[in-house]
Amino acid sequence: MMTGTIETTGNISAEKGGSIILQCHLSSTTAQVTQVNWEQQDQLLAICNADLGWHISPSFKDRVAPGPGLGLTLQSLTVNDTGEYFCIYHTYPDGTYTGRIFLEVLESSVAEHGARFQIP
């Protein structure tokens, strides 16, 4: 039975040209995390494998930094980066847990972080 929950940074906003940290945290399970995939809509941005380390997709390698932890840092943000991001935790023996973050990239300096929320 899958007992874990994923806590994410929720709905967040950031300024164009700036950077943002995407963070998820898996709790309430003793399952072993083997890999975390970070996806934007249907596009894979990065993989953090427990053994192999980070794999950043080439089209993002110049502006995506691994970490902190299992999170992902997006740099040099553009308005096109606005959208849904998913952290997909591959665990053993539980299976797969998915968290969702919505990022809005703003032109002005009124960007504020949204509230954290949980996805069961």
């Epitope: 380390g53 794999h55 390698k61 299976g95």
Partner: antibody, heavy 119, light 106 residues
Framework: EVQLVQSGAEVVKPGATVKLSCKAS????????INWVKQRPGKGLEWIGR????????KYAEKFQGRATITTDTSSNTAYLQLSSLRSEDTAVYYC????????????WGQGTMVTVSS | DIVLTQSPDFQSVTPKEKVTLSCRAS??????LHWYQQKPDQSPRLLIK???QSISGIPSRFSGSGSGTYFTLSINSVEAEDFGMYFC????????FGQGTKLEIK
């Protein structure tokens, strides 16, 4: 055309060290990850390790830890595998595939380098 | 390390036949399973990534399926050029390959 061209065959003595090269063309190695894979005659494939040429970060299979060293020279777009303390079981073809754009699979392979360890 | 066991070790088929090769993992690897073909004295060639995703330039007769611990590679209508070794590879943990299946065309 995206390709990886490897150095020529080597014949080395037991206990020696060999350094193999893998030159990339059609892409910048800093944009991807370069791996090395061993294949003994008539046998299966064994992953040795990988490097992120952008920062030099390496990971090795436990079996090859301490004996294999993967490096790159980004100015010449070339990756290297150095294997030390060679023994007869190291007689094999060594391949340098690059990782795919979306993970730890291998979408482009070098032609392979045959290494023969013999006294 | 995760062990991949391929079956059969050897298969002989006639052209236009459908072939199914299997790869079983010693523990669940989600869909982190990839397939390669290797002909004698050639480098391996990627056929399928992530269990079922097709690769540009690979004939559509090659398809993959499976998840967890059991995966298959199917060749819909075998052609003479499909002979060789077929290897599976997992990327859920330290990278490992199956021992291979040798495909012979009668």
């Amino acid at each position: 055309e995206v390709q990886l061209v490897q150095s020529g065959a080597e014949v080395v003595k037991p206990g020696a060290t060999v350094k193999l090269s893998c030159k990339a063309s059609g892409f910048n190695i800093k944009d991807t990850y370069i791996n090395w894979v061993k294949q003994r005659p008539g046998k299966g494939l064994e992953w040795i390790g990988r490097i992120d040429p952008a920062n030099g970060d390496t990971k090795y299979a436990e079996k090859f830890q301490g004996r294999a060293t993967i490096t790159t020279d980004t100015s010449s777009n070339t990756a290297y595998l150095q294997l030390s303390s060679l023994r007869s079981e190291d007689t094999a073809v060594y391949y340098c595939p690059k990782s795919g754009d979306y993970g730890w699979y291998f979408d482009v392979w070098g032609q392979g380098t045959m290494v023969t360890v013999s006294s | 390390d995760i062990v991949l066991t391929q079956s059969p070790d050897f298969q002989s088929v006639t052209p236009k036949e459908k072939v199914t090769l299997s790869c079983r993992a010693s523990q669940s690897i989600s869909n982190n399973l990839h397939w390669y073909q290797q002909k004698p004295d050639q480098s391996p060639r990627l056929l399928i990534k992530y269990a079922s995703q097709s690769i540009s330039g690979i004939p559509s007769r090659f398809s993959g399926s499976g998840s967890g611990t059991y995966f298959t590679l199917s060749i819909n209508s075998v052609e003479a050029e499909d002979f060789g070794m077929y290897f599976c590879q997992q990327s859920n943990s330290w990278l490992t390959f199956g021992q291979g299946t040798k495909l012979e065309i009668k």
